[in-house]
């Protein structure tokens, strides 16, 4: 395969540039991201000395993707700066393959193997230098660049320490064989951020898991701050194309955030799918089920294609605080299927949350424990109390008449009423479990337009002598 690719390298022409000369390695010294023109090339040791390449330090290779502009975009500048700030002694190399990336998408895709081989050859050459170790190499590829990194890891003699795929490109890579895309076999640790996956239309980012751990912020699709509402206001972007760019590029900014906001690390939680995560089922850190994201992701044994999820803010710092809420709804009447809208406000030692809606993913289970996911942008500190509100919903005259008749026959219980004795909460970030109880055990009922207050009554979830209230069904 290598010989074949070598031949391709020698003969392939892309516009005015021969493919062999179409990849440049732009070594960025810490003299500032504006410094230009320190290029590395295989067999030429002088630039390594001139630009003070540190053989024993970590080495990052940043690999861009397809481009329509023919220039290296600002995300790259931000990523270089962030890496240099976080890892002051590290070598940062930008892989410039603009001649092959500034083409039709299909042509750029067909060039990814050649570019990957070129990166591998650079790494092979560097391995011959005293002190240089492949284990210290971290390839960071965005979009098509993620697959380039995969090919580089596949072709290099030995094993690269880490590859980070930042929203690896989807078209022409989705569902293909592991040797034709980024895969866990390409490095000792492959971590991936998926931010633009779509199950309908074209998915710019790959949907399938392709690393050891695959992190899907906000389910991997609709990123906060990138919606049409946000962009039409022209706060950050102005067109549909810019919405796409915003969501696709969010992976890069999450990675940058993990470098610069060390004190505000985001955590992702293992889950089988986005829906289960939205239900709040997956906030466990047991058995390596949670991990840092971006630069802070850690290799865990025996994980492969592990899907992980988290919620984020709309901008840096992206960190939010996740809470699992377990609520048992007791129903004293067979009210049929109800679709209530619940809101909670969390009160902590540091702050109180905004009014948070409880997302009902499927349907409320009556006389059953329901699990919800809520998240706050601010650190509330230790939770003290919770206000639960059932939003009054507009109903037909017939519904109101039925309720009025029901009230006449049984004045003490409106038909649309539920009873909640306690709320159990688990913090994703601290893994702490708390139980919140109603103040008066006799006043546990809630109806549309009403609110219930719950106060911290226990650390942990297990209650002594728990007994279920008698359920009256009529």
């Amino acid at each position: 395969a290598e010989e074949q690719l070598e031949g391709g390298l020698r003969t392939a022409k892309d516009g005015p540039a021969a493919a062999k000369a179409a990849v440049r390695f732009h070594f960025r010294t810490s003299k500032g991201p504006e410094r230009e023109g320190c290029y590395l090339s295989v067999g030429h040791s002088q630039p390594l000395e001139d630009c003070s390449f540190n053989m024993t330090a970590k080495t990052f290779f940043i690999i861009h993707g397809w481009t329509m502009s023919g220039m290296l975009e600002n995300w790259l500048h931000k990523l270089v700066s962030a890496l240099q700030m976080r890892e002051k002694d590290a070598n940062v190399v930008v892989v410039d393959w603009l001649p092959l990336a500034h083409q039709l998408y299909t042509d750029a895709v067909n060039s990814t193997r050649v570019v990957g081989l070129s990166v591998a050859k650079m790494l092979d050459w560097l391995q011959g230098k005293d002190g240089f170790s492949l284990g210290n190499v971290h390839l960071i590829g965005y979009s098509l660049g993620a697959h380039v990194a995969g090919f580089a890891g596949n072709f290099v003699k030995g094993t690269v320490g880490r590859i980070t795929g930042l929203d690896p490109a989807g078209p022409m890579f989705e569902g293909v064989d592991i040797h034709r895309r980024l895969s866990p076999d390409d490095a000792d640790f492959v971590d991936v951020l998926h931010t633009y996956t779509r199950s309908f239309g074209i998915s710019i980012g790959i949907q399938m898991p392709v690393g050891h751990i695959d992190i899907y912020p906000n389910g991997g699709d609709f990123q906060p701050g990138c919606g049409l509402n946000d962009v039409l206001g022209s706060i950050a972007y102005g067109t549909i194309a810019e919405v796409v760019k915003c969501e696709h590029e969010r992976a890069v900014h999450l990675f940058v955030d993990s470098l610069v906001n060390q004190d505000k690390p985001s955590f992702a939680f293992q889950c089988t799918d986005s829906n289960r995560f939205k239900k709040g089922i997956c906030l466990s850190c047991r058995k390596n089920r949670c991990n840092g994201i971006g630069y802070n992701a850690k290799k865990t044994r025996n994980k492969r294609n592990t899907k992980m999820y988290l919620k984020t803010r709309a901008g840096m710092p992206f960190r939010v605080y996740h809470y699992q809420m377990k609520i048992h709804f007791f129903s004293y009447k067979s009210v049929g299927a109800i679709e209530p809208t619940f809101y909670v406000t969390l009160y902590g030692t540091n702050a109180e949350s905004q009014v948070l809606s409880l997302e009902i993913v499927e349907q409320i289970g009556l006389n059953a424990t329901n699990t919800f996911l809520v998240y706050t942008e601010e650190d509330l500190g230790d939770l003290l109390k919770i206000k639960l509100t059932w939003e009054g919903t507009s109903r037909s005259w017939y519904d109101l008449w039925r309720e009025f008749r029901s009230y006449l026959s049984q004045p003490h219980r409106p038909e649309r009423e539920l009873s909640i004795r306690r709320i159990r909460v688990k913090s994703g970030e601290t893994q702490r479990r708390l139980t919140f109880c109603v103040e008066d055990p006799e006043k546990t009922s809630i109806a549309p337009g009403q609110e219930l207050w719950f106060y911290k009554c226990r650390d942990g979830w297990r209650m002594k002598n728990e007994t279920s209230p008698t359920v009256e069904l009529s």
Epitope: E34, E36, N74, H77, L98, P99
Partner: antibody
């Protein structure tokens, strides 16, 4: 010392075409991109487009898509901009400017400008 | 396209004065803001890149600041050679766009 030397002033008739040159010296020509900027009389600056001399890739402002064609000759470290179907609206000073390969790089060195006058 | 607005088209000042020229972007440009000086003979020079980074050879009396959509160029202790036109330019999004310019003249 980085220098961008542009060709001299041009006086042309409507409908004609013109090719303005920008010769670079004092740095490695392929390490930076060359951009072209228009300044109409007494007005602001407008970005026309750029060329990456390393491989000849170009990108134009939509407004100038059908007006300007950018090329380079690597052997002489010279960038060219051809303007076609000239009208009086094209009368302006045209600058070439050097920029790194990053969006974020500024236009760090400029040519002295080429004055184009289109008149019948 | 991102609109760059320099509200003050002309500014009069005396030698030794301190002047501030402002520039506003129609949307957040993430500090990708550059300042240029154009002399009456048409010569254009880079002064400041990335909001506040002084280009080599530019006197330290020039400084830049700002964030989001609002940026400014300050010249302290004006000298004779500083009387010129100043343009801001955003490097955040294609097409790159410039402000309309502020002409600084001697009072």
């Amino acid at each position: 010392e980085v220098q961008l030397q542009q060709s001299g002033p041009e006086l042309l008739k409507p409908g004609a075409s013109v090719k303005i040159s920008c010769k670079a010296s004092g740095y490695t020509f392929t390490d930076n991109t060359i951009h072209w900027v228009k300044q109409s009389h007494g007005k602001s600056l407008e970005w026309i487009g750029h060329i990456n001399p390393y491989y000849g890739g170009t990108n134009n402002n939509e407004k100038f898509k059908d007006k300007a064609t950018l090329t380079v000759d690597k052997s002489s470290s010279t960038a060219y901009m051809e303007l076609r179907s000239l009208t009086s609206e094209d009368s302006a000073i045209y600058y070439c400017a050097r920029k790194g390969i990053y969006y974020s790089s500024p236009f760090d060195y400029w040519g002295q400008g080429t004055t184009l006058t289109v008149s019948s | 396209d991102i609109q760059m607005t320099q509200t003050t088209s002309s500014l009069s000042a005396s030698l030794g004065d301190r002047v501030t020229i402002s520039c506003r972007a129609s949307q957040d440009i993430n500090n990708y803001l550059n300042w240029y000086q154009q002399k009456p003979d048409g010569t254009v020079k880079l002064l400041i890149s990335y909001t506040s980074k002084l280009h080599s050879g530019v006197p330290s009396r020039f400084s830049g600041s700002g964030s989001g959509t609002d940026y400014s160029l300050t010249i302290s202790n004006l000298e004779r050679e500083d009387f010129a036109t100043y343009f801001c330019q955003q490097g955040n999004t294609l097409p790159f766009t410039f402000g309309s310019g502020t002409n600084l003249e001697i009072k």
